[in-house]
Amino acid sequence: CPTSCKCSASRIWCSDPSPGIVAFPRLEPNSVDPENITEIFIANQKRLEIINEDDVEAYVGLRNLTIVDSGLKFVAHKAFLKNSNLQHINFTRNKLTSLSRKHFRHLDLSELILVGNPFTCSCDIMWIKTLQEAKSSPDTQDLYCLNESSKNIPLANLQIPNCGLPSANLAAPNLTVEEGKSITLSCSVAGDPVPNMYWDVGNLVSKHMNETSHTQGSLRITNISSDDSGKQISCVAENLVGEDQDSVNLTVHFAPTITFLESPTSDHHWCIPFTVKGNPKPALQWFYNGAILNESKYICTKIHVTNHTEYHGCLQLDNPTHMNNGDYTLIAKNEYGKDEKQISAHFMGWPGIDDGANPNYPDVIYEDYGTAANDIGDTTNRSNEIPSTDVTDKTGREHLSVYAVVVIASVVGFCLLVMLFLLKLARHSKFGMKGPASVISNDDDSASPLHHISNGSNTPSSSEGGPDAVIIGMTKIPVIENPQYFGITNSQLKPDTFVQHIKRHNIVLKRELGEGAFGKVFLAECYNLCPEQDKILVAVKTLKDASDNARKDFHREAELLTNLQHEHIVKFYGVCVEGDPLIMVFEYMKHGDLNKFLRAHGPDAVLMAEGNPPTELTQSQMLHIAQQIAAGMVYLASQHFVHRDLATRNCLVGENLLVKIGDFGMSRDVYSTDYYRVGGHTMLPIRWMPPESIMYRKFTTESDVWSLGVVLWEIFTYGKQPWYQLSNNEVIECITQGRVLQRPRTCPQEVYELMLGCWQREPHMRKNIKGIHTLLQNLAKASPVYLDILG
């Protein structure tokens, strides 16, 4: 770090005038990674006069640049060419006499402060006046310039003849063109000073060439590619004062292609995943064993992601049986042609022949797209009937087997209910329990981020054998009823699950911790909870919606939480159901959520803190945190739980750097920018999701492994948001195209390799959760932790 400056992982700060800096600060090789620097603050540096072309280029992540009360006289035209993330520039009280708009034209600045510079009145600075007028906000700057007679005049009053904005005019034919054809665009520009003209074609794939004079130009695009559909082409006129552009959107029509069609995968429902390209929107038609498949609410097409002319989705089958096994053909058709692909699907064996997998029900209600032979995106209502066209050729034997299955299932179900009732009576008499303690009915689906998978003998990571989805945890997500709930095996829903009931008078609220969609969370004291302590601090989650469904969800969640017991899962103490609101009681974790904790113990927080500053997390402490989260995830996987929202915001920190998985359902409110809203209700943590979860809503233990990799990245960046520099749509594009997060500066190579092992595109290629935990444990052991971080 240069003398007179100090450097952290993300900031450079130079304010000491002695000795001061004479050149823009540069970092030593092998010190801080310049790509991670987001802020540079320079003050009192009177001998800093120039920013050269290559001074700032290494700081590609730079967002805030402040140079104040210094000697800055000249900024090279291409100084900020590589700094596309720059948002705030403050050059207050320097020695700038002129500043070209060329420095900034490619930047999306939200702030450019130029107060207190001795600008010379000329056409060169007219763009600043134009910019100020365009902003027209109440906090416009008082800018002045010196005229020929060395008089300071307000920039707002500056009048210079032959110095105005240019204009661009694009003469374009109808820009809807068929793939493979060619097109020519013409453009004319005008203005004083005479503008330059250029074409902005973005990332156009098709071959193109332009002929440009000063005021006229043409662009010829040949053999147009379907990849260019939806792209914008602009003709830009630019002079000293500013620029004008005229744009057209290119629409390319082409025949559909089915680029991806795979065997069914199971998660919370069965899904035959596909990707189709085509423009205009192709109509999709499914065939089952050669006959048209009429879609219904049980078998329907869902489009999850649309990228211009590319559609990722599923043929979703709710509760398919052996009768749905067979060949599925997808035909995509528009006026330019059609494509078809076929796959064989096996959902379940014949009754009594093989065990097959349990069917699934989705936990989130997605928008429904497309009936039979409709365009993608058509949301017309469908018949609720199960289609008959696909079963007409079945034999009577199959119908008999269906009746047999129904009868047997009914008898078994009835027996189970009787057994539960008897068990309940037996418990009451055996333990002589008083009060309302009982087995809470489990008659509806829960509403939270941890998901229970019961699939018989399947491994926790198995995605093939239709797992049963029962959601538990602490976050409210819209759900639809799961008729398979009673199919949970003894190993998952313990028959002796008794949710502890806590008397309301034993709970004394102290203060509010936050609020989620479901209700408020409070810090409270709970009396008579533990025999060894008179009272303990707890976190209390209240339920504001007292509807029947919400109450059922509440009871379901309580029962499932009672079964989750591990040192790295937040402890659930019980419920209070006397009157309203309904209350859930959890252990209180003193230091709050892990994301907040990481940020508070990062270099920036340490640098900026006043008074009693926090200490920066060491590498060994980071490893200690990581291995605890991995331990919690090993446990969840062993219990056949898929979390679906693993992130540092959903982990909590207690005394002595103890970390546990669990949140109080406030993440979607407190960390709303971490979620991407799909439709009305669903909020997806896309920055933590693997490609198959984004494209096909497929959540498995392997998708949790991917998220764990992102959590490791969060830990080693002190709580940065993954892909913080990208918008949600850009993130979706990046992840689905196979890009991964870069190695954090503080991250050892072995840990980054572990992250890369979590981010393998193919789920089955990802590291095993137990292996991840073992590796992190070994790394943490090799690097002992000193727990003074918490003071």
Epitope: T3, S4, K6, D16, P17, S18, K46, K95, E610
Partner: antibody, heavy 116, light 110 residues
Framework: QVQLVQSGAEVKKPGESLKISCKGS????????IGWVRQMPGKGLEWMGI????????RYSPSFQGQVTISADKSISTAYLQWSSLKASDTAMYYC?????????WGQGTMVTVSS | LPVLTQPPSASGTPGQRVTISCSGS????????VSWYQQLPGSAPKLLIY???QRPSGVPDRFSGSKSGTSASLAISGLQSEDEADYYC???????????FGTGTQLTVL
């Protein structure tokens, strides 16, 4: 050689004004900050403020803001420290110093005595 | 006003090694470079150490400086009688946008 020469000792009455000087030589006077430091009898050093003679930009310590004025005349390579109304508590030795890598060059000091 | 804290006095016999500490906060010593000054009786201060541990030409190598976190220290080895003086540390303070001096340490050579 590089040096800073300060004006001579002053004896003043409370309420009077005073301007003491510090002349630089042997280096580019406009390119370095000049600071002023107070040392009251038997006490430690106290930083008062700095000026950049190139553009007369100043920084004051909060304790001295509004109590003194620091100025410079670059044409004669001289920095000044002035009071509009002296108090008995202003009695002290005042040093000017050039700021480069630390305060590397010091004036010999000006003793200011304020008494009625 | 935040000042840097030094012990009021220190002493040693000729040839001995003495250390003078200087304690500050994150906004001064913790985030910026420290310089040390020697003031012989009746003289103007003189720069002894700059940028935490650098010696200007002419300063004997018996004088050395170091910094760790929000504290700095000046070490004098092979103490000599002419080292008897007041010693001050100083650093830029970001929150004040100005310099701060230490309280000063009077070194006595016994």
């Amino acid at each position: 050689q590089v040096q800073l020469v300060q004006s001579g000792a002053e004896v003043k009455k409370p309420g009077e004004s005073l301007k003491i000087s510090c002349k630089g030589s042997g280096y580019s006077f406009t390119s370095y900050w000049i600071g002023w430091v107070r040392q009251m009898p038997g006490k430690g050093l106290e930083w008062m403020g700095i000026i950049y003679p190139g553009d007369s930009d100043t920084r004051y310590s909060p304790s001295f803001q509004g109590q003194v004025t620091i100025s410079a005349d670059k044409s004669i390579s001289t920095a000044y420290l002035q009071w509009s109304s002296l108090k008995a508590s202003d009695t002290a030795m005042y040093y000017c110093a050039r700021h480069d890598y630390g305060m590397d060059v010091w004036g010999q000091g000006t003793m200011v005595t304020v008494s009625s | 006003l935040p000042v840097l804290t030094q012990p009021p006095s220190a002493s040693g016999t000729p040839g001995q090694r003495v250390t003078i500490s200087c304690s500050g906060s994150r906004s001064n010593v913790g985030g910026n470079t420290v310089s040390w000054y020697q003031q012989l009786p009746g003289s103007a201060p003189k720069l002894l150490i700059y940028t935490n541990n650098q010696r200007p030409s002419g300063v004997p190598d018996r004088f050395s400086g170091s910094k760790s976190g929000t504290s700095a220290s000046l070490a004098i080895s092979g103490l000599q009688s002419e080292d008897e003086a007041d010693y001050y540390c100083a650093a830029w303070d970001d929150s004040l946008n100005g310099y701060v001096f230490g309280t000063g340490t009077q070194l006595t050579v016994l």
